[in-house]
């Protein structure tokens, strides 16, 4: 009932709690002398379902049969309407529509840790929409029983608060849960178990790792466990990996040796425990231990390449380059690189430690046979040195790879192809493909890139440090013993017409012809590899088509003669540049009048 119901009553039959699909009869009755003043025929009783009128009657009582009520609670209110006044609330009732409880399913019990308490969970089945009470019963040896009740609206868990002990680990216990509401009751199937079945150990704690003599090959994992634990599972992985290595151990007594860890790698370790080989369940995984394994001396060898540059008649510059070892080869933090330069005949040697760089430049005499050795060092030792004899890499013309081409291959890739050298192709031990950004003037500070290719390959895809709209000087070296041959080509991954034409900076007259000089187009405006320059000229104030001369692009060239101009005629000259994608806009215009004699 709701409100004080001083003026009347609302009765519900057969009950305030009904099964889904049932019909109820609701009666609203006025108490004596509680109707409208004077004229009782004018009493109008109105029945509301929530805030909606559903029935009415003139008189002292209203009878209404209600069907189709939904699951849950529905509120009915009876009001009295008199002429010329607001409706007055008489009384109300809530009707609870639900179902009998289904049989609880999948009853399972667990005790967390040897000192924990027994708790059980189950599946309630579909919601009854009614107040439903659950009773959990546990019976054990010697007619011992425990009982716990749950009055939560959604009850599917109860803790008995009792601790099963390992004195008789094979003793049987039986649990059962019963659900009861106004419409019926139902019990689960009984669940029978022993101490060993339901005790789930606490996860191991206090996990530590020790490396004997700071060596990754002598590593022991330590932890603490509850007293009855028989089995452990260990899992570990490098911190940057998703895949676990798994190890099962029996009677480990809180320690285990790990033999397959990689050096200088951060690992994550976790451990789980179990009391019995085939009974019970595994504990949760322990909290993670994160630890870095010690360094070991580097393995593998550095990939070393070099460049020679002529300085003068007696000296040459050697630039050495090498690539970082991979993490698995470095096996630690590389502290420095050791470079040894030796003159092979005289035996003179110099050694230098390089930190923070992967290149080294020195000047040596042009005479003598020179060799270098480069190795990487960490706190535990050095990699095996990579030895290279310094030679003229392009000296053997017969070893030069043929028909070298460079073609764009998708975004920021260039496919370099070649044919083996004319000289016995089987003599080639390896190819090296080298590339660097093309800078007029051959700037030696430009980073050098290279990759090695097996002798049977005739192509290589270069993608490292390749940018769009940049021209690269690409060389393919064929190496055989202490000889080498090379061929070069220009290539780009993406190109478009240059953004500007060359700037003519001077026009000079010599012997009846002119020499035009220009400034190179800035690299960032070339938009790829230049193929040609064009020089255009026409008589000033003439509307005729200009004449032109096309010059193949060469890196070092920045002047060209023209000998087809007429003397004492003023010409306007300009230049453009072309890539494979098209021609640039005009460069600056210059006027010139040839002073030479007329023929």
């Amino acid at each position: 009932k709701i409100d004080a119901c001083k003026r009347g009553d609302v009765t519900v039959k057969p009950s305030h709690v009904i099964l889904l699909g049932s019909t109820v009869n609701i009666t609203c009755s006025l108490k004596p002398r509680q109707g409208c003043f004077h004229y009782s025929r004018r009493n109008k009783l109105i029945l509301y379902k929530f805030d909606r009128r559903i029935n009415f009657h003139h008189g002292h009582s209203l009878n209404s049969q209600v069907t189709g009520l939904p699951l849950g609670t529905t509120l009915f209110v009876c009001k009295l309407a008199c002429i010329n006044s607001d409706e007055i609330q008489i009384c109300g009732a809530e009707i609870f529509v639900g179902v009998a409880p289904e049989q609880p399913q999948n009853l399972s019990c667990i005790q967390k840790g040897e000192q924990g308490t027994v708790a059980c969970t189950w599946e309630r089945g579909r919601d009854t929409h009614l107040y439903t009470e659950y009773t959990l019963q546990l019976s054990g040896p010697k007619n011992l029983t425990w009982q716990k009740q749950c009055k939560d609206i959604y009850c599917d868990y109860l803790d008995f608060g009792i601790n099963l002990t390992p004195e008789s680990p094979e003793s049987n216990f039986t649990a059962k849960v019963t659900a009861v509401n106004s419409l019926g009751s139902s019990s689960s199937l009984p669940s029978t178990f022993t101490f060993l079945d339901i005790v789930r150990p606490l996860p191991p704690w206090d996990i530590r790792i020790k490396f004997q003599k700071a060596s990754v090959s002598r590593c022991t994992l330590y932890w603490r466990d509850e007293g009855l634990v028989l089995l452990n599972r260990l899992r570990y992985r490098p911190s940057n990996s998703r895949l676990w290595n798994m190890v099962n151990v029996t009677k480990a007594k809180g320690r285990h040796d790990l033999l397959d860890l990689k050096p200088f790698t951060e690992y994550e370790f976790q451990i789980s425990s179990k009391l019995h080989l085939y009974k019970g369940s595994w504990s949760d995984w322990s909290e993670s231990l994160r630890a870095q394994t010690p360094e070991e001396e580097p393995t593998g060898m550095l990939d070393v390449w070099y460049m020679k540059r002529h300085i003068d008649y007696s000296r040459q510059q050697i630039s050495l380059f090498w690539k970082n070892l991979s993490v698995s080869e470095a096996r630690g933090k590389i502290l420095h690189y050791q470079v040894t330069l030796q003159e092979l005949t005289g035996g003179k040697a110099m050694t230098q430690n390089i930190t923070g760089h992967t290149s080294w430049t020195t000047v040596i005499p042009r005479t003598g046979n020179w060799a270098v050795a480069v190795s990487a060092a960490n706190s535990k030792g050095s990699s095996l040195p990579t030895r290279i004899n310094i030679m003229n890499l392009c000296e053997a013309g017969l070893l030069a790879p043929r028909q070298v081409s460079a073609n764009s291959e998708g975004m920021d890739n260039i496919l370099v192809t070649w044919q083996p050298p004319r000289k016995d192709p089987s003599a080639v031990q390896e190819y090296v493909v080298e590339w660097r950004e093309l800078h007029p003037g051959g700037d030696t500070q430009v980073p050098l890139n290279w990759l090695r290719s097996r002798p049977y390959n005739v192509s290589a895809l270069i993608s490292e440090n390749i940018k769009s709209y940049i021209c690269y000087e690409i060389r393919v070296y064929a190496l055989s013993g202490d000889q080498g041959g090379c061929s070069s080509i220009l290539g780009n991954s993406k190109h478009k017409a240059p953004l500007s034409g060359p700037h003519i900076n001077a026009i000079t007259e010599e012997k009846g012809s002119i020499l035009i000089s220009w400034n190179s187009i800035p690299v960032q405006e070339q938009m790829g590899c230049l193929l040609h320059y064009r020089i255009y000229w026409k008589e000033r104030d003439s509307n005729s088509q200009p004449q032109l001369c096309e010059i193949p692009y060469r890196v070092s060239q920045n002047s060209h003669p023209i000998n087809s101009l007429q003397p004492r005629v003023t010409y306007v000259l300009w230049m453009t540049a072309l890539t494979a994608a098209g021609e640039s806009s005009h460069g600056n215009e210059r006027e010139f009048c040839l002073q030479g004699k007329a023929n």
Epitope: K49, R53, F56, H57, G59, S64, G68
Partner: nanobody, 123 residues
Framework: QVQLQESGGGLVQAGGSLRLSCAAS????????MSWVRQAPGKGLEWVSS????????DYADSVEGRFTISRDDAKNMLFLQMNSLKPEDTARYYC????????????????WGQGTQVTVSS
Amino acid sequence: QVQLQESGGGLVQAGGSLRLSCAASGFTFSTYAMSWVRQAPGKGLEWVSSVNSGGLSTDYADSVEGRFTISRDDAKNMLFLQMNSLKPEDTARYYCAKYEDCSDYVCDRAGYWGQGTQVTVSS
């Protein structure tokens, strides 16, 4: 699903009579109070009359009191409206509805409505 089908409308002279019928299906008719509602051209819905679920109590709008009579036949799931002394201002489309969708001057357009039947009273 709920279905309400009105019939019996037509053209009638002022002062004449008509009997409207409503056939109900898709719900337990006998347990529901029912109403008649009308809508004149260009106007809103206007409650006309209601009958309770037992058929023992009726209510009428002041404009039709004494001229119209509402009744029901629960055995046939039928609702009726007997209209006498018709006036030109009774011209409208007449709908039957559950009382919970339209009662005592309050109509809920979210409720279920049939197609209605047209009543035209000429002077």
